[in-house]
């Protein structure tokens, strides 16, 4: 029987922020409750001279009035005692986009092909997650190599999220677009 308590989830050992920096394309996602990036999601991670990690992300968001906008999001990461677990503060460049604070865990990555991210926003009393989200990232916008897919599927299982992901379309919708010139 799988242990689905969040405290039991393993993350990347000796996570290296510098090696993780650069462009990552989201290939699949498990959504949380509420408004969330839909598709065409691309993230750019960087590390400054003090060692702080930050990220920018772009993706299509469907607003409540059924408007599609390409959202520019920014996130800054605060280190914790585990090098693969961060506190992420995020906000949208446009005022109507979400802002907040989430845990941001790098569950696994080989830095060159794949990465699995996980965040639990709300715990159940039994320690399992009541509201989580997760991304599968690839360095290649065309997808993951087969051997990486196998590893990712295993990680999805270990997060007790197997088959709760949806594939993410990359069709160029947000190329050269942002919410500033859409609205």
């Amino acid at each position: 029987e799988r242990d689905c308590r969040v405290s039991s989830f393993r993350v990347k050992e000796n996570f290296d922020k510098a090696r993780f920096s650069g462009t990552w394309y989201a290939m699949a996602k498990k959504d949380p409750e509420g408004l969330f990036l839909q598709d065409n999601i691309v993230a750019e991670f960087s590390v400054d001279e003090t060692g702080q990690m930050s990220a920018t992300a772009k993706g299509r968001v469907r607003l409540l009035n059924n408007w599609d906008v390409c959202a520019d999001m920014v996130g800054t990461f605060t280190d914790t005692e585990d090098p693969a677990k961060f506190k992420m503060k995020y906000w949208g460049v446009a005022s109507f986009l979400q802002k907040g604070n989430d845990d941001h865990w790098i569950v696994d990555t080989d830095y060159d092909t794949y990465a699995v991210q996980y965040s639990c926003r709300l715990l159940n009393l039994d320690g399992t997650c009541a509201d989580s989200y997760s991304f599968v990232f690839s360095r290649d916008p065309n997808g993951l190599p087969p051997e990486a897919q196998k590893i990712v599927r295993q990680r999805q299982e270990e997060l007790c999220l197997a088959r709760q992901y949806r594939l993410i379309v990359h069709n160029g919708y947000c190329d050269g677009r942002s919410e500033r010139n859409l609205l």
Epitope: L144, P146, K150, R166, L167
Partner: antibody
Framework: QVQLQQPGAELVRPGASVKLSCKAS????????MNWVKQRPGQGLRWIGM????????HYNQMFKDKATLTVDKSSSTANMQLSSLTSEDSAVYYC?????????????WGQGTSVTVSS | DIQMTQSPSSLSASLGGKVTITCKAS??????IAWYQHKPGKGPRLLIH???TLQPGIPSRFSGSGSGRDYSFSISNLEPEDFATYYC?????????FGGGTKLEIK
């Protein structure tokens, strides 16, 4: 666009075997499982099994374990299903359908089906 | 194995009308139900997945709802191209199981 191409029909003798093909195009073949589904005349749909084109990992419905063998040819992006020891019960339309490796495995695109008739 | 009981097996309706089809699972399928439209000589076409999520390009006349073991699928403002056979599919369990189908005919 996504296409799964299947031959229209196959006529085979009782006791013989038949190999059905499903040629995929319009997407990355190894990013999706390939499933096979059976439909007997006037009846509903029944899942036979699925294969991972990247390494030929298979999962079968136990009911078809001794009847169907799933294979792939990555070089031509083609999935195959061999049906053995055919009887009249195997006369049916057989569909291939893909499902995403990293997603929820939903059968999102289907071929048009191959009609297999077992008759002497 | 999970069984899916779909009803009715057939129904007739008028253009512009509304129909509802139900599927009952033999156990909780955690909303992992999909609905397909099937026409002769073609492969089934995915309309709805995860109980109520419309596939891209599928008109909002199609809708789905339910939870646990009980699920329903509706078509409103019926158009000529909607007359076909509809199937539910549970995909919570790796041994996919389809409902028996509902043939929708013009009244």
């Amino acid at each position: 666009q996504v296409q799964l191409q299947q031959p229209g029909a196959e006529l085979v003798r009782p006791g013989a075997s038949v190999k059905l093909s499903c040629k995929a195009s319009g997407y990355t073949f190894t990013n999706y499982w390939m499933n096979w589904v059976k439909q007997r005349p006037g009846q509903g749909l029944r899942w036979i099994g699925m294969i991972d084109p990247s390494d030929s990992e298979t999962h079968y419905n136990q009911m078809f374990k001794d009847k169907a063998t799933l294979t792939v040819d990555k070089s031509s992006s083609t999935a195959n299903m061999q049906l053995s020891s055919l009887t009249s019960e195997d006369s049916a339309v057989y569909y291939c359908a893909r499902s995403p490796q990293l997603g929820d495995y939903i059968l999102d695109y289907w071929g048009q089906g191959t009609s297999v008739t077992v008759s002497s | 194995d999970i069984q899916m009981t779909q009803s009715p097996s057939s129904l007739s309706a008028s253009l512009g009308g509304k129909v509802t089809i139900t599927c009952k699972a033999s156990q909780d399928i955690n909303k992992y139900i999909a609905w397909y439209q099937h026409k002769p000589g073609k492969g089934p076409r995915l309309l709805i997945h995860y109980t109520s999520t419309l596939q891209p390009g599928i008109p909002s006349r199609f809708s789905g709802s339910g939870s646990g073991r009980d699920y329903s699928f509706s078509i409103s403002n019926l158009e000529p191209e909607d007359f076909a056979t509809y199937y539910c599919l549970q995909y919570d369990n790796l041994l996919w199981a389809f409902g028996g189908g509902t043939k929708l005919e013009i009244k």
